[in-house]
Amino acid sequence: ESALITQQDLAPQQRAAPQQKRSSPSEGLCPPGHHISEDGRDCISCKYGQDYSTHWNDLLFCLRCTRCDSGEVELSPCTTTRNTVCQCEEGTFREEDSPEMCRKCRTGCPRGMVKVGDCTPWSDIECVHKESGTKHSGEVPAVEETVTSSPGTPASPCSLSG
């Protein structure tokens, strides 16, 4: 199943929550790292490394931990209160419109353009026209037109889901 559910997707009704941890729900909610039991009378802990919950909630199950795909590196592991944080490997990036896969960064800009931004895990290299300074559309140029450059190093991690 390609659809990724996060607790934000499932939690339209955010309610102010009490601060102390309890084994039974407080005001009908269970703390992060737990889900509510079928009868609504207990809070059941999520399984470390398998599932998680990030907010006070009345979900009847915890959310599955994301597994990083090949081509991704794991920046931080899944805990009972936080999903795995995955990041594209060096030289690749993830676009907002195609978040399901890491794409290779271009190796250079087309002729007549200069590189103003490095490859990061969340963006391709950025090219602008020498004269006008306007950005290039992002089409991959023909090989003979490219001016080679090395991929940049990641500046900061990008989180895929809450």
Partner: antibody
Framework: QVQLVQSGAEVKKPGASVKVSCKAS????????MNWVRQAPGMGLEWMGR????????FYNQKFKGRVTLTVDKSTSTAYMELSSLRSEDTAVYYC???????????????WGQGTLVTVSS | DVVMTQTPLSLPVSLGEPASISCRSS???????????LHWYLQKPGQSPKLLIY???NRFSGVPDRFSGSGSGTDFTLKISRVEAEDVGVYFC?????????FGGGTKVEIK
């Protein structure tokens, strides 16, 4: 719009099994529980259990545990209810019905299938 | 299991007149979280049940405001302020406070 379309009527012999399907459309299939409820002729409604398409968990009414198996095919957004060791008292209309993943709003069914009549007769 | 008892079994009413259906549970339906999980469905002839009211008094989307629910503890009521022809069918109450969830036996509303 949300639609739950069930398979056609079935006639079965005592001791046999029946498998009823429920095809969902108009919403994210993995975003809701799929419940099964039955209604015997002239009788009330009886909740049998529910399936969680997100993680594959099942939760059954103890009365049916061991005799009912709930499954889904996520690729076709279809839920299935299989009832085994059929007896005449299992003659009923079987409904699939959707409910939310939250305790506070998960105990009522906002959309129902049209029902599938299962007749158990020798 | 919690037993849900509905009265009357059958309710003949005149068009435009009010109607009232009672539902009584064998145990309190007040959950430890303070909420009461009592719901009402209408099953029109030849159709599947449709949700009318959830959690005692909340009308489901598209349900006319002539339908209202009330009650607490073990005693609950569904009221129709002015019965219309399309309101004919069997009304069921159900509870989800206690597992397994259970339904009442139904009340058949018909036009006199």
């Amino acid at each position: 719009q949300v639609q739950l379309v069930q398979s056609g009527a079935e006639v079965k012999k005592p001791g046999a099994s029946v498998k009823v399907s429920c095809k969902a459309s108009g919403y994210s299939f993995i975003g809701y529980f799929m419940n099964w409820v039955r209604q015997a002729p002239g009788m009330g409604l009886e909740w049998m259990g529910r399936f969680n398409p997100y993680n594959g968990d099942t939760f059954y009414n103890q009365k049916f545990k061991g005799r009912v198996t709930l499954t889904v095919d996520k690729s076709t957004s279809t839920a299935y209810m299989e009832l085994s060791s059929l007896r005449s008292e299992d003659t009923a209309v079987y409904y699939c019905a959707r409910s939310a993943y939250y305790f506070d709003s998960g105990g009522y069914f906002d959309y129902w299938g049209q029902g599938t009549l299962v007749t158990v007769s020798s | 299991d919690v037993v849900m008892t509905q009265t009357p079994l059958s309710l003949p009413v005149s068009l435009g007149e009010p109607a009232s259906i009672s539902c009584r549970s064998s145990q309190s339906l007040v959950h430890s979280n303070g909420n009461t999980y009592l719901h009402w469905y209408l099953q029109k002839p030849g159709q599947s049940p449709k949700l009318l009211i959830y959690k005692v008094s909340n009308r489901f989307s598209g349900v006319p405001d002539r339908f209202s629910g009330s009650g607490s503890g073990t005693d609950f009521t569904l009221k129709i302020s002015r019965v219309e022809a399309e309101d004919v069918g069997v009304y069921f109450c159900s509870q989800s406070t206690h597992v397994p969830w259970t339904f009442g036996g139904g009340t058949k509303v018909e036009i006199k």
